[in-house]
């Protein structure tokens, strides 16, 4: 079939039909890209959006049950999603163990060991207690 495109008027000739390029007047939303159709247009949506005009939010929580790790709760949002992490975890997908040692108050000279949502202090000789703040009576 004869196919001709006249750039000045955005006209396509397919056989004996005249098909106008509908993309100049498109209304693709949320980053959608217009793709001309026969007497209409379609929208190619970014991953976070769907629907004929990219107006429907994709529910990533439904599509990716493991979007949030380590017990985090997935919260769908317009154009994306977020994770509500349980204590001890952080990051976009709750995959990062919070460094509890950064806020720990182990006595100087002791060694902090990071755990999930907690920390422990490894005491040097002669010290005891959770924070190694006590003198170890056994070593006196």
């Amino acid at each position: 079939a004869h196919h001709h495109h006249h750039h000045g008027e955005n006209l396509y000739f397919q056989g004996s039909e005249r098909n106008i390029d509908d993309c100049p007047n498109h209304r693709c939303q949320n980053g959608g890209v217009c793709v001309d159709g026969v007497n209409t247009y379609n929208c190619r949506c970014p991953p976070q959006w769907t629907g004929q005009f990219c107006t429907e939010d994709v529910d990533e929580c439904l599509l990716q049950p493991n979007a949030c790790q380590n017990g985090g709760t997935c919260a769908n949002r317009n154009g994306g999603y977020g994770c509500v992490c349980v204590n001890g975890w952080s990051g976009d997908d709750c995959s990062e163990n919070i460094d509890d040692c950064a806020f720990a108050s182990c006595t100087p000279g002791s060694t902090c060991i990071d755990r999930v949502a907690s920390f422990s202090c490894m005491c040097p000789e002669g010290k005891a207690g959770l924070l190694c703040h006590l003198d170890d009576a056994g070593n006196s």
């Epitope: 209304r27 949320n30 107006t55």
Partner: antibody, heavy 120, light 107 residues
């Protein structure tokens, strides 16, 4: 909170020019289509011009009644939309509204409007 | 351009009444229809988008329906604050076009 505030309206003679501004806040300006809509006194709403978002290269569309006379533009650094109106006619007299196209094929936020009067 | 035929142009009703406004488009707009409320001296306010979806903060007495070329806005039980002018608008393609408006007046 999404806010749109128009300014720049006033009285102008036929053939004259005027530049309207619309300062926006509360959202990422470049992510949204922005529109100008007008309303003559006691009449209905008439769409004037649109500028698409960054994802659509900020492309522009005009109504037939203002094409070649009006120019829509935006300054992302100032979060401001503009409407430059040249060769004004008496029939351009109206309240001009700036609105946000909220990604739903609908205008979900509007400014308070600014009155443009074209009269000799 | 897509033509919008809105009816009636005005309606007199009482508080508690059910009010129905219709909008017909000259071609299929694939449910790309919005409804707005406008009060004198104020900006339009979005009520319904996507033909049937209620905008955040809009009372549930407002509802929209329709597809193709025929659309309806219904106010199930008219309240004193609902007396205003209502407009339909197609968002399928530019130029955006609005219906002529329906003024809801107190009977």
């Amino acid at each position: 909170e999404v806010q749109l505030v128009e300014s720049g309206g006033g009285l102008v003679q036929p053939g004259g020019s005027l530049k309207l501004s619309c300062a926006v806040s509360g959202f990422t300006f470049s992510d949204f289509y922005m529109e100008w809509v007008r309303q003559a006194s006691g009449k209905g709403l008439e769409w004037v011009a649109a500028q698409r978002n960054k994802a659509n290269d900020f492309s522009i569309v005009y109504s037939a009644s203002v094409k070649d006379r009006f120019t829509i533009s935006r300054d992302d650094s100032k979060s401001t939309l503009y409407l430059q109106m040249n060769s004004l006619k008496t029939e351009d007299t109206a309240v001009y509204y700036c609105s946000r196209d909220g990604g739903k094929l609908a205008l979900d936020a509007w400014g308070q409007g600014t009155l443009v009067t074209v009269s000799s | 351009d897509i033509q919008m035929t809105q009816s009636p142009s005005s309606v007199s009703a009482s508080v508690g009444d059910r009010v129905t406004i219709t909008c017909q488009t000259s071609e299929d707009i694939y449910s790309g229809l919005a409804w707005y409320q406008q009060k004198p001296g104020k900006s339009p306010k979005l009520l319904i988008y996507g033909a049937s979806r209620l905008q955040d903060g809009v009372p549930s007495r407002f509802s929209g329906s329709g597809s193709g070329t025929d659309y309806t806005l219904t106010i199930s039980s008219l309240q004193p604050e609902d007396f205003a002018t209502y407009y339909c608008q197609q968002g399928f393609k530019y130029p955006l076009t609005f219906g002529g408006g329906t003024k809801v007046e107190i009977k």
